[in-house]
């Protein structure tokens, strides 16, 4: 019966005297007065079986001890680890000249597992074993014992098994543990290829070439090979396997991507979380499905988020000048998650009596810089008819607009050509500046050209450079602009509107908000 002891994964134990429960029962010659089996207590106060001999008073000792038959199990080279303790001859009184401090290790290959006698002539010598200078001190019961460990190897072996023998020539020695093992390169997975348990070669420099097989749910990229070295270590991995689409490497295996993850190709990448606005409902997904209302453009990679058409442009402003119109607007609040936003202009000519009866403007109208695919947020429309109502629609479009076009993506304005708009406002003043607000006032335009219906104030942070502006409308010639940021420079423009349309914006007024309240009376110049 053997107890379990833990050894390195690359060693396969054929014999371990420490694991045997009860007597070892090896064969000694002579039967009496030579090697003797003795129980000692180990560090856990458990009895262990050892063999000892201490015939140090007489010269010419020749005491043999032979193990039982040891199966080879296909190994061509085996290793013998001997843990022993040797008593110094000078610690024994009156034995100088007869006491030795070495013993000899022998082996004999045999197919017969029941040889009863020791025939010394059959055995081949492996080595003479001496106590090393370096030894381990171990607790045996309550004692500290100097334990030497020596390892020898023998091979190539060819028969079914073998016997080991220990020859004592007059030492005071105890064999505390004898372990016989061979080395293998243990089953392993490298680069997603599995390599089987492989017994090492016959000599200490041999390398055994082993071809690996791809693990489940993977495919060969290059033929996987490794070499099993004599010490039981795998060497020089060549080639590899890659996890299939929908699978990723985890602890040397290809695991299906979890729900909510995907992998599009056979690569060494991990599964990725489904991009925003998409999902997978099965394990092992190779792509993710877009959420309702979200889409992928034809040239979008599987790794890109699903996106949607943009919302309508904001703050559309028109400026009519006889038969020309300048339109200006802000980017949509929601770009749909895409960068490829552009704008299309739709021009409709409408009847004066019934504005709902509108027709396309036709090709006589010109657009600067262009009508469709605008990247800027302004356009000039020329060559319009005089005294005509026009409706202009500005459509925000992106790469997925075609999958779900909707009126929600446009903003429109209706204008009448050939009516004079008011002139620009000459003087804008900042009456009061606080941390969070600016009080503005201005004069009526020199040429109102009719009844002024309202004023429009456009403002933006100076460093935003008109990229993101806000509009405030008022019937009065003053207004409080609130919700500003402290210590920030703002630029303000004001224009008037009559039934004919908007006039031009005033010159810019630049104002910096305060940290403490103060009254600043503007004089038309920049106020800071």
């Amino acid at each position: 019966v053997t107890g379990s002891r833990v050894y390195p994964a690359n060693e396969v134990t054929l014999l371990d005297s420490r694991s045997v429960q009860g007597e070892l029962g090896w064969i000694a010659s002579p039967l009496e007065g030579g090697w003797e089996e003795v129980s000692i207590m180990d560090e856990k106060n458990t009895p262990i079986r050892t063999y000892q001999v201490c015939n140090v008073m007489e010269a010419s000792q020749n005491n043999w001890l032979r193990t039982d038959w040891i199966t080879r199990e296909g190994a061509q080279r085996v290793y013998i680890e001997i843990k022993f303790t040797l008593r110094d001859c000078n610690s024994l009184p009156g034995v100088m000249g007869t006491c030795k401090e070495t013993f000899n290790l022998y082996y004999y290959e045999s197919d017969n597992d029941k040889e009863r006698f020791i025939r010394e002539s059959q055995f081949g010598k492996i080595d003479t074993i001496a106590a090393d200078e370096s030894f381990t001190q171990v607790d045996i019961g309550d004692r500290i014992m100097k334990l030497n460990t020596e390892i020898r190897d023998v091979g190539p072996l060819s028969k079914k098994g073998f016997y080991l023998a220990f020859q004592d020539v007059g030492a005071c020695i105890a064999l505390v543990s004898v372990r016989v093992f061979y080395k293998k390169c243990p089953l392993t997975v490298r680069n997603l290829a599995q390599f089987p348990d492989t017994i090492t070669g016959a000599d200490t420099s041999s390398l055994v070439e082993v071809r690996g097989s791809c693990v489940n749910n993977s495919e060969e990229k290059d033929v996987p090979k490794m070499y099993c070295g004599a010490d039981g270590e795998w060497l020089v991995p060549i080639g590899n396997c890659l996890c299939n689409a929908g699978h990723e490497e985890q602890n040397g295996e290809c695991q299906a991507c979890k729900i909510g993850y995907y992998k599009a190709l056979s690569t060494d990448a991990s599964c990725a979380k489904c991009p925003p606005h998409s999902y997978s409902v099965w394990e092992g997904a190779t792509s993710c499905t877009c959420d309702r209302g979200f889409f992928r453009a034809d040239n979008d990679a599987a790794s890109m988020p699903c996106t949607r058409p943009p919302s309508a442009p904001l703050n559309l402003i028109s400026n009519v000048n006889e038969t020309s119109v300048n339109l200006e607007w802000s980017s949509p609040q929601n770009t749909g998650g895409r960068q490829d936003i552009s704008y299309n202009v739709v021009c409709k000519k409408c009847g004066a009596g019934d504005p709902s009866k509108c027709r396309p403007c036709g090709s006589g109208v010109h657009y600067t810089p262009q009508q469709n695919g605008l990247k800027t947020t302004r356009v000039s429309i020329t060559d319009l008819l005089a005294h005509t109502n026009y409706t202009f629609e500005i459509w925000a479009v992106n790469g997925v607009s075609k999958y779900n076009p909707s009126p929600d993506q446009s903003v429109s304005v209706t204008v009448t050509t050939n009516q004079a708009a008011p002139s620009s406002i000459a003087l804008v003043q900042a009456k009061e500046v606080t941390r969070y607000s600016v009080a503005l006032a201005w004069l009526e335009p020199d040429r109102p050209n009719g009844v002024i219906l309202e004023y429009e104030v456009k403002y933006y942070e100076k460093d935003q450079n008109e990229r993101s502006y806000r509009i405030v409308r008022t019937a009065a010639r003053n207004t409080d602009i609130k919700g500003l940021n402290p210590l920030t420079s703002y630029v303000f423009h004001v224009r008037a509107r009559t039934a004919a349309g908007y006039g031009d914006f005033s010159e810019p007024l630049e104002v910096t908000t305060n940290t403490v309240p103060s009254r600043i009376i503007g004089d038309g110049a920049n106020s800071t």
């Epitope: 009496e32 007065g33 201490c54 007489e58």
Partner: antibody, heavy 121, light 106 residues
Framework: QVQLLQSGAEVKKPGASVKVPCKAS????????MSWVRQAPGQGLEWMGW????????TYAQGFTGRFVFSLDTSVSTAYLQISSLKAEDTAVYYC??????????????WGQGTLVTVSS | EIVLTQSPATLSVSPGERATLSCRAS??????LAWYQQKPGQAPRLLIY???TWATGIPDRFSASGSGTDFTLTISRVEPEDFAVYYC????????FGQGTKVEIK
């Protein structure tokens, strides 16, 4: 089997000598040292010393020098204890015991049956 | 000379009980200590050497431990044949015995 055979009881007068034999059998006599132990009536054990059976070299314990001599006759595998100038306090059982050296320690593993020496006028 | 002191002088136990005997050295003897059993009218018998190693044929109900100056012999379950006198003995340059502990039937 291994055994040590000692002679029967001896009665001696004070001032006399006695030679106690110890015959070994069942093992190679010269391969193990021989020790001598005394036990006075009703008392404990007292180690007297030992002799190297290979070289004949004796070692005596404190208090057992002078009148006590260890000797050998290897041809008949026998060790001897000789006591001269006997005194009444020498009355005791005298044991021979084979000395066992081992890696783990030493001990007297085989004992003779003992020889009672009585010193009385 | 190293003096060995054994205690108790007499130990009364019933068969099947555990017996623990002590031996203390006047100076360290490392693990160089043996235990012997002696029954009336018989020669001593080696039980333990090297402080804790069983001699040949000794049942495993006998066990021993210790090193340096303090040593213990334990009989886990005393059998009728275990009633005897037990001696400890140290072996250094010169050997000495303890005075003995008598284990008797309670």
């Amino acid at each position: 089997q291994v055994q040590l055979l000692q002679s029967g009881a001896e009665v001696k007068k004070p001032g006399a000598s006695v030679k106690v034999p110890c015959k070994a059998s069942g093992y190679t006599f010269t391969s193990r040292a021989m020790s001598w132990v005394r036990q006075a009536p009703g008392q404990g054990l007292e180690w007297m010393g030992w002799i190297n059976t290979n070289t004949g070299n004796p070692t005596y314990a404190q208090g057992f020098t002078g009148r006590f001599v260890f000797s050998l006759d290897t041809s008949v595998s026998t060790a001897y204890l000789q006591i001269s100038s006997l005194k009444a306090e020498d009355t005791a059982v005298y044991y021979c015991a084979r000395v066992r050296f081992t890696v783990y320690g030493d001990g007297m593993d085989v004992w003779g049956q003992g020889t009672l020496v009585t010193v009385s006028s | 000379e190293i003096v060995l002191t054994q205690s108790p002088a007499t130990l009364s136990v019933s068969p099947g009980e555990r017996a623990t005997l002590s031996c203390r050295a006047s100076q360290s003897v490392s693990s160089n200590l043996a235990w012997y059993q002696q029954k009336p009218g018989q020669a001593p018998r080696l039980l333990i050497y090297g402080a804790s190693t069983w001699a040949t044929g000794i049942p495993d109900r006998f066990s021993a431990s210790g090193s340096g100056t303090d040593f213990t012999l334990t009989i886990s379950r005393v059998e009728p044949e275990d009633f005897a006198v037990y001696y400890c003995q140290q072996y250094g340059p010169s050997w000495t015995f303890g005075q003995g502990t008598k284990v008797e039937i309670k």
